[in-house]
Structure formats: C-alpha cells, structure tokens
C-alpha cells in the first residue's frame, strides 16, 4: 500500500494530463483526487503511465468505489483494465456492448482469460440474457469467448441467436456447455434440409444424445473424424459398426489412426471382432467371435 503524505502545493492536480507521468507513486497518491480521476477517466489511456503508476490510480478508484466501479468509469479503463482481477470485475454491473468491445480490445494479446470470462459473465447478467447483439460482439471481438460462459449463463441464449454462432466460436466449449447449446441449435435449425442442417448442427454435436446420432447415421452425412471424436462418449458407445460406417462414410477409414483415443478406443472394445473386420481397417480389440456379452449392470438394477 502507498503511504499517505500531503500533497506539495506546486504538485496539486486540477486535471488529468501528461504532466502526471513525472509524479512519483506517493505524489500521485497524495495529489490526485479520486473523484477527478473518475470524471476524467477518458484521458488516462492516452497518457503513458508506468504499471506502478497505474497501480496507484487503481488504488484510488478502489477507495472511491469499494462496491465496484460505475460503468462510466469501466468504459474508459483502457490499459487500467489489465490491472483488474476477476474479484474486482465481479463487483461490476456492465450493460453496454461498447464497454465490452473497448475492454476486449485492450485485453487482446494479454493473458487475461479469467478476467475476460468474468467480464462477459457480468455483461450477460447486466443485460439479462445472452442476446444476439452480445453474441455478435463476442464472435467479432473475442472468438472462443462464448465458451468461457458457464452452462447456466448459456442457458439464457434464445434459439433464434444460435445462427450467429460460428464453428470456431465453439472450439473450446466443453461437454456441459454443448449439452446446453445443442437442444437450442436443434430447435433453431429444425426447418433446414438434410445436408444444410448437418452443416449447421455439426459444431454443436458434442451435446447430441445417442438417438440423434443414430438418426444422423441414416442421412448420408459423411461426418468427419474430428466431429465424431467430439461426440459424447455415452452417445458413441451404443452405436453399431454398421451405424458408425454409415455415419462416417469415407471418413470411417480414419478410425485406424485414432484407435487409441477416446471415444474410438472405448467403442472398439464394445464391438464384435467380426463386425470390426468388415470395416477393412485391421482394427483389433473387439469382443472375440463366439463370446457372450453379459450386461451385469442390468442384473444389479433388478436385484
């Protein structure tokens, strides 16, 4: 913490300007009025403050706004945003997409994924839902940031907005997020024809249940291997060799090079070896011919 001193009369600050870069930390602390700083935040980013000086300015704002900064200040934080922790950001109430854009631009190229995730979360809370304008802003200024939101926040996405989401925006989404987004996407694209539907739904398929995957296998979609391997393990395991063959089409050949990776490995172990042999890939590890498969989980459920 910066020690308190009184401000020398000749150092008194009446406006935020370039002369402040020559102030020592303790002089900034003593001479800059927090209310003046807040009122003239739009000037701060144009001044080449050191990181140490920015620490002092942040300290000033923290004292003035212990419950969190108002949006008028947040919008103009500029490089001061780089000093914020997720805990700081959690106190904010942000509704303006201009504020979001400004801060996303500042954070670019810096290791701030936790701060950005918290900021986006605050915007969604502030706006009440993840609307189309917010999604458009995220996809334009922060590809992949959509996946930083919790499944609970993503549940506020109306299906009508799903069309604005691009495949690359979902690259970092986990299974729980795709579980939330997939039903919305299914609803959003339900009136599309077979091939057009598959192109649109493909990035969301990591949330698809087995019955939907089975249905896709009847539609000649030729799913690529990367998409197949993003499917839920529980959705893949019940598929038969014939269904996987139909689902992947020519890409089924790639199972050979991915046989050690989940869910391919787990799926192979559940297939009959003679069925696997029909794939013409030399896949090994299936259930030997003549063996009987007992599902003990069913017996346990009955006892």
């Amino acid at each position: 913490d910066v020690e308190r001193t009184t401000c020398p009369p000749e150092k008194e600050v009446h406006e935020i300007d370039e002369s402040l870069i020559f102030y020592k930390k303790r002089e900034l602390e003593a001479c800059v009025d927090a209310a003046l700083l807040a009122a003239q935040m739009d000037r701060v980013d144009a001044i080449p403050f050191t990181y140490e000086q920015l620490d002092v300015l942040k300290h000033k704002l923290d004292e003035l706004y212990p419950q969190g900064y108002p949006e008028s200040v947040i919008r103009h934080l500029g490089h001061l945003f780089l000093k914020m922790s997720p805990e700081d950001i959690r106190k904010w109430n942000v509704t303006s997409l201009e504020t979001l854009k400004a801060l996303l631009k500042v954070s670019k190229g810096h290791e701030m994924s936790a701060q950005v995730a918290t900021l986006i979360d605050r915007v969604v809370v502030g706006r009440g839902q993840l609307d189309k304008d917010t999604v458009d802003t995220l996809t334009a200024f922060c590809p992949g940031c959509l996946c930083s939101l919790s499944p609970e926040r993503l549940s506020s996405v109306p299906p009508s907005v799903i069309g604005a989401v691009r495949p690359q925006d979902l690259d970092t989404c986990g299974p729980r997020q795709l579980d939330v987004l997939y039903p919305k996407a299914r609803l959003a694209f339900q009136n599309m024809s077979g091939s057009e539907y598959f192109v649109k739904i493909r990035p969301f398929l990591g949330g698809a249940p087995t019955e939907d995957v089975k249905a896709l296998s009847q539609q000649n979609v030729s799913m690529d291997l990367a998409t197949f391997m993003k499917l839920r393990r529980e959705a893949v395991l019940p598929l038969t060799v014939a269904e996987v063959q139909k689902l992947l089409g020519p890409h089924v050949e790639g199972l050979k090079v991915e046989e050690q990776h989940s869910p391919v490995r787990d799926w192979i172990l559940k297939q009959r070896q003679d069925d696997l042999d029909t794939l013409g890939l030399g896949l090994q590890g299936g259930i030997p011919n003549g063996y009987l498969i007992l599902d003990l989980s069913v017996r346990e459920a009955l006892s």
């Epitope: 690359q168 690259d171 030729s222 690529d224 291997l225 990367a226 391997m229 993003k230 063959q245 089409g249 020519p250 890409h251 050949e253 790639g254 050979k256 090079v257 991915e258 990776h261 989940s262 042999d277 029909t278 794939l279 013409g280 890939l281 030399g282």
Partner: antibody, heavy 115, light 113 residues
C-alpha cells in the same frame, strides 16, 4: 515388402472404357482401403475415390462419380478402376495408393486417350 | 471442398542450403480431440510416384531422413529441408485428409542450382 503393381501404359480410343488394375502384395489386402489418384502432365494430384476391400464399399469425389467405378477382387488381392466414356481430358497417370495416409503408391498407369 | 495453397510454386537452392515451403488450408485441419493435424507431405521425384514424407503435419514416415521437418497446425503448415541434398530434387505436395474430397496443394518444385 509392400508392393502395389500397376501396368505401365494403356492406349484407348475416345468414347471407350478401360479397366485399370492394381495388384497388392506384402500386406493383408483387406486391412487397408485402396485409393485412386489422378495426375495430369505438369499438373497437381486429384483424389478420385476409395474402396474398402473387405466389403466393397466405395466413396467417390463428386467430380468423378460418373467417370470412375472402383471394385476389388479379394481372391487375387487386386483393386480395379474402370473409367468410362473416355475423352482426351482423361489422359493422365492414375495411381493406386494404400490406406488413409497413402503410405504406399503404385508406379502409376499412363492412360492415353487418342484416336 | 478444402482448398490447399502451396508456395512458392518453385524454388532453386544450392546443395547444403536450408529450404522452407508453405502449405495453407482454407479451414483448420486440427482434430482437437487427438491434437492431430490431418495433413501429409509427399515427395515426387521426376518420373516416379509420390512418396509419403510426413503425416499428421509433423510425424516423419519411417526411412525419411532427419533433414525433412514438418511443422504447423490448424491452417498453416511448413515443410523444411535442412541442408538440401542433390537427391531432394522433386515436387513436394501437401494433402489434407480431414474431409472428403481429399485435396492436394498445387505443389512446390525444388530445383538444385
């Protein structure tokens, strides 16, 4: 060692059909799919399609769907590609190649379509 | 279809020099589940059939000399030949096997000065 043997040349007249062969040896024929690739003089490579020798399933590049027909004879470990309604545009070197990685290639058959 | 773009189309170097060629794809070739890029490099010497050099963007096929190095991920890939030898005179093609139709780049012709 793995070998894919293809005849060196085929000379056919426009409008005719031709059946190119690719005899595999040195590995289990039904454990790798066979691919066919076209290369015109001084030009790049084009994937025509592939076939699963185990069950005969075929997949084609849309561009060659009405031009090429892929088959296999498991008993002789030979893959075939029939090309129909030949024109001068079909004059090229045709290669067979093994598996998803195309890790082994035949020497190629030079097809000349000329009257 | 995925478009594969190679550059330069040709280059001439002296024996012992290092050479770099580029291959760009119109969409990502990365399978994020297995962290494999579905990209291969082939060498085609004059009058011969193509030969697999590198697969998964950076894995050398058996018997390929150490001077051949594949690198890159997503959409941008590079084949580097450290200390070019006279026998490296050939066309070099990249190819994606992410999705059908599998497509090749136009090739880079390597000439020896």
């Amino acid at each position: 060692q793995v070998q894919l043997q293809q005849p060196g040349t085929e000379l056919v007249t426009p409008g005719a059909s031709v059946k190119l062969s690719c005899k595999a040896s040195g590995y289990s024929f039904t454990s790798y799919w066979m691919h066919w690739v076209k290369q015109r003089p001084g030009q790049g490579l084009e994937w025509i399609g592939n076939i699963n020798p185990s069950n005969g399933d075929t997949f084609y590049n849309e561009k060659f769907k009405n031009k090429a027909t892929l088959t296999v004879d498991k008993s002789s470990s030979t893959a075939y590609m029939q090309l129909s309604s030949l024109t001068s545009e079909d004059s090229a070197v045709y290669y067979c190649a093994r598996g998803w990685l195309r890790d082994y290639w035949g020497q190629g058959t030079t097809l000349t379509v000329s009257s | 279809d995925i478009v594969m773009t190679q550059s330069p189309s040709s280059l001439a170097v002296s024996v012992g020099q290092k050479v770099t060629m580029s291959c760009k794809s119109s969409q990502s070739l990365l399978n994020s589940s297995s962290q494999k890029n579905y990209l291969a490099w082939y060498q085609q010497k004059p009058g011969q059939s193509p030969k697999l050099l590198v697969y998964f963007a950076s894995t050398k096929d058996s018997g390929v000399p150490d001077r051949f190095i594949g690198s890159g991920s997503g959409t941008d890939f590079t084949l580097t030949i450290n200390s070019v030898q006279a026998e490296d005179l050939a066309d070099y093609f990249c190819q994606q096997h992410y999705t059908t139709p599998y497509t090749f780049g136009g090739g880079t012709k390597l000439e020896i000065k």
